[in-house]
Amino acid sequence: ESGYAQNGDLEDAELDDYSFSCYSQLEVNGSQHSLTCAFEDPDVNITNLEFEICGALVEVKCLNFRKLQEIYFIETKKFLLIGKSNICVKVGEKSLTCKKIDLTTIVKPEAPFDLSVVYREGANDFVVTFNTSHLQKKYVKVLMHDVAYRQEKDENKWTHVNLSSTKLTLLQRKLQPAAMYEIKVRSIPDHYFKGFWSEWSPSYYFRTPEINNSSGEMDPI
């Protein structure tokens, strides 16, 4: 449901598009959760605009967001995580537009970290491992990970592998020999919770060894 300003002072505001999107991060700082919202139109004049969330909160009816440059942000323990909250863009007491959202359906996990690749000479493969803070969390524990890798010279030819664990084996014969590779990983909720892909982890770079087998052949990627 959206409510639009009726006040004559707000006629200009009514002409603007106040579409916005939000994502939540649960237990992002100990037991604190966060909610981040931003306008979809980067040219919206946000000078007098505020965001407010009401409903499905603990011990309060509503909370106001903090404005951090172009984004609006809340960090709190007060999300009930049951039922829908009403998130509104406001000018003063007037709601310009609102969305009813269950915060457990807009979860953006934290980016994976400590990505590394170890070559196993005897097995002729590469063991990719990474870490995620979500293993220690109470709520968003189960994630799907997207590992993407490419030869450094191939700008847009990423190969993607989806996995639920934090370990992946890449066979040497599936990679080009004596080549530099870039690899990165991101995560998305996969069980109970819904939402968005995390940011990518920092990339890790590794080099494949020269060919040393008798045939001198390797499978293409």
């Epitope: 409903g55 309060v60 009930l80 995580l81 039922g83 009403n86 269950d102 457990t104 109970y192 819904k194």
Partner: antibody
Framework: QVNLRESGGGLVKPGGSLRLSCAAS????????MHWVRQAPGKGLEWLSL????????YYADSVKGRFTISRDNTKNLLYLQMNSLRAEDTAVYYC??????????WGQGTLVTVSS | NFMLTQPHSVSGSPGKTVTISCTRS????????VQWYQQRPGNSPTTVIY?????PSGVPDRFSGSIDSSSNSASLTISGLVTEDEADYYC?????????FGGGTKLTVL
């Protein structure tokens, strides 16, 4: 139009078990928080349990914690209440209720559970 | 844990106005929304007020809800009483994830 229909009530002996079902239609079941509430004969409403849209979050009143289990099957639009170790004081009409976009709830017509030897 | 206390019964004549109170025992009445349910004899409850003062569609504007911080209570006011208003009325709020109901008030239309 929201429609909730409870079933599974009946007469059961103390210590026995019963499973109540609630068939839902007329709304998007798999994004709704669902509750069980009961009403003993001639008494007021008592909240028992809730389950989040996905089944991850479940909460119980102290009076039924450890004895009752709430669950849902979103593929069938069904809500359940498994009741074990039933006592005479559990005799009541049991309602399922849908939590609206906020807290404006819709209720079923109820099913009577009688616990007696 | 808090309780919600309602009068056991209220009454009023057709056309008159009655108010049913719902007092929170501890914590602020402002800290979570209050709902009101009507339950006619032999029927299941229906929502007449949600979020303190919002009426679901189909509920006449004779029903109104309010919050009074000074008395730490919520109120349901029914004006222009009609015989069909005779029912039990329950307030409800939230204690974290738990629903808390008032004990109910029997409204008699004289």
């Amino acid at each position: 139009q929201v429609n909730l229909r409870e079933s599974g009530g009946g007469l059961v002996k103390p210590g026995g078990s019963l499973r109540l079902s609630c068939a839902a239609s007329g709304f998007t079941f798999d994004d709704s928080v669902m509750h069980w509430v009961r009403q003993a004969p001639g008494k007021g409403l008592e909240w028992l349990s809730l389950v989040g849209w996905d089944g991850f979050f479940t909460y119980y009143a102290d009076s039924v914690k450890g004895r009752f289990t709430i669950s849902r099957d979103n593929t069938k639009n069904l809500l359940y209440l498994q009741m074990n170790s039933l006592r005479a004081e559990d005799t009541a009409v049991y309602y399922c209720a849908r939590q609206g976009d906020y807290m404006g709830n819709n209720w079923g017509q109820g099913t009577l559970v009688t616990v007696s030897s | 844990n808090f309780m919600l206390t309602q009068p056991h019964s209220v009454s009023g004549s057709p056309g008159k106005t009655v108010t049913i109170s719902c007092t929170r025992s501890s914590g602020s009445i402002d800290s979570s929304y209050v709902q009101w349910y009507q339950q006619r004899p032999g029927n299941s409850p229906t929502t007449v007020i949600y979020e303190d003062d919002q009426r679901p569609s189909g509920v006449p504007d004779r029903f109104s809800g309010s919050i009074d911080s000074s008395s730490n209570s919520a109120s349901l006011t029914i004006s222009g009483l009609v015989t069909e208003d005779e029912a039990d009325y329950y307030c409800q709020s939230y204690d974290f994830h738990h629903l808390v109901f008032g004990g109910g008030t029997k409204l008699t239309v004289l």
